[in-house]
């Protein structure tokens, strides 16, 4: 069995379309290099949202592109998911390689269900 | 055992916190009076949200001053709880019972988690 | 498609240098630590070294500690196997890999002879 | 140079079952993960079962793994041609502190 990642099994969405939560693994090493990645479950398909590695000193970065920001503290990692919309809710898992020095290790969460709202249009103003 | 009750286990209110749910029941009879109880739980309390009888011939009617409306069909009741807001996030059970002819029977589903998201305020129009 | 191909090998004379070259394509290779392997003639997998993704640290088996040196450019998305001192036994083909062992490349021969 | 124990050669028929053994120590497989390669002649090893003894991309259902102590077994079932090749194991050994390999198992499919 691969390392345990836990995150949480729901997260509502905002209104405007952002979604945070928290990845937690389990390392007995102190990894220095660190990659985390965003997968969408749907059916039994995986699409990858985003990706980072970070290292233990520095913050965690993404693609300036990506629809995901994040930090990292010690073995947790606040992940933030933007832009999303109602027919985004879906499984969210949460993978996490322990990437260097060796030896490399590797966890999935269960998925965090993200639910998304779509807001009413606000009126027109006159 | 009761009467089985079942009902979604989740179910997301509108931006404009309207949640709707089916609420069904198992009967061997033919009732021609049913109750309708939406509860919500949190930690081990269960507070009544609204409440409704109903006959087979006439539609389902909530109380003026209620958060709900329903209609009803057979054995399958629509819920739609109203005004809801994030903080009314939780579980809501819905309890049937068989008032009349006897036997009396009461089954309550396992629950259905409502989300609800507050919508972020409109701009104000300059 | 991901894609990692060694160069630089040759037939080169005990106590000899040389430099191998991994260039990779189609993925953020800056987001990947790496390793090198080798594999000689008739024998099993062996790990040489590995490096961050940044090029900031490194780490090496014993029987190559002293003598071979990676580096990295991530400009060029290609890590670097330095090798001196060279001995016979050091003949093997060598191959780069990414560090979560997802990719391998298909391998360039060192050939240490006189 | 290596340290995780391999059969030279096994060998099975199209459509059959074959098991390939790694028996370690409990400095490394005794008390860390097992990864497989398959490599095919002229080419750099393939990752056919990751170090979280999930299979990796692309890789069918008829690879398994399993590992009772200080031996990992790898079985191929439904035999195919293009399973001809050679295949090593590796895990992490936690008195060495590094990577170790088996030797290689070359598997050779039978007319």
């Known amino acids: 069995k691969g390392m345990h990642v836990a995150q949480p099994a729901v997260v509502l969405a905002s209104s405007r379309g952002v979604a945070s939560f928290v990845c937690e693994y389990g390392s007995s090493g102190n990894a220095a290099e660190v990659r985390v990645t965003v997968l969408r479950q749907a059916g039994s398909q995986m699409t990858e949202v985003c990706a980072a590695t970070y290292t233990v000193e520095d913050e965690l970065a993404f693609l300036d592109d990506s629809t995901c920001t994040g930090t990292s503290s010690g073995n947790k990692v606040n992940l933030t998911i933007q832009g999303l919309r109602a027919m985004d809710t879906g499984l969210y898992i949460c993978k996490v390689e322990l990437m260097y020095p060796p030896p490399y290790y590797v966890g999935m969460g269960n998925g965090t269900q993200i639910y998304v709202i779509d807001p009413e249009p606000c009126p027109d103003s006159d | 055992k009761g009467m089985h009750v079942a009902q979604p286990a989740v179910v997301l209110a509108s931006s404009r916190g309207v949640a709707s749910f089916v609420c069904e029941y198992g009967s061997s009879g033919n009732a021609a009076e049913v109750r309708v109880t939406v509860l919500r739980q949190a930690g081990s309390q269960m507070t009544e949200v609204c409440a409704a009888t109903y006959t087979v011939e006439d539609e389902l009617a909530f109380l003026d001053d209620s958060t709900c409306t329903g209609t009803s069909s057979g054995n399958k009741v629509n819920l739609t709880i109203q005004g809801l807001r994030a903080m009314d996030t939780g579980l809501y059970i819905c309890k049937v019972e068989l008032m009349y002819p006897p036997p009396y029977y009461v089954g309550m589903g396992n629950g259905t988690q409502i989300y609800v998201i507050d919508p972020e305020p409109c701009p104000d129009s300059d | 498609e991901v894609q990692l191909v060694e160069t630089g090998g040759d037939l080169v004379k005990p106590g000899g240098s040389l430099r191998l070259s991994c260039v990779a394509s189609g993925f953020s290779f800056s987001s990947y630590a790496m390793n090198w392997v080798r594999q000689a003639p008739e024998k099993g997998l062996q790990l040489v070294g590995g490096?961050?993704?940044?090029?900031?640290?490194?780490y090496y088996t014993d029987a190559v500690k002293g003598r071979f040196t990676i580096s990295r450019d991530n400009a060029k998305n290609t890590v670097y196997l330095q090798m001196n001192s060279l001995r016979a036994e050091d003949t093997a083909v060598y191959y780069c890999?990414?560090?979560?062992?997802?990719?391998w490349g298909q391998g360039t021969l060192v050939t240490v002879s006189s | 140079q290596a340290v995780l124990n391999q059969p030279a050669s096994v060998s099975g028929s199209l459509g059959q079952r074959v098991t390939i053994s790694c028996t370690g120590s409990s400095s490394d497989i005794g008390k860390s993960y097992v990864a497989w390669y398959q490599q095919l002649p002229g080419t750099g090893p393939r990752t056919l079962i990751n170090?979280?003894?999930n299979r990796a991309s692309g890789v069918p259902d008829r690879f398994s793994v399993s590992r009772s102590g200080n031996t990992a077994t790898l079985t191929i079932s439904g035999l195919q041609a293009e399973d001809e090749a050679d295949y090593h194991c590796?895990?992490?050994?936690?008195?060495?502190?590094?990577?170790?390999f088996g030797s290689g198992t070359q598997l050779t499919i039978l007319g």
């Open positions: 170090v979280d003894g």
């Open positions: 490096i961050n993704s940044g090029g900031s640290s490194t």
């Open positions: 890999a990414i560090s979560n062992w997802a990719y």
């Open positions: 590796s895990s992490w050994d936690w008195s060495l502190h590094t990577y170790v």
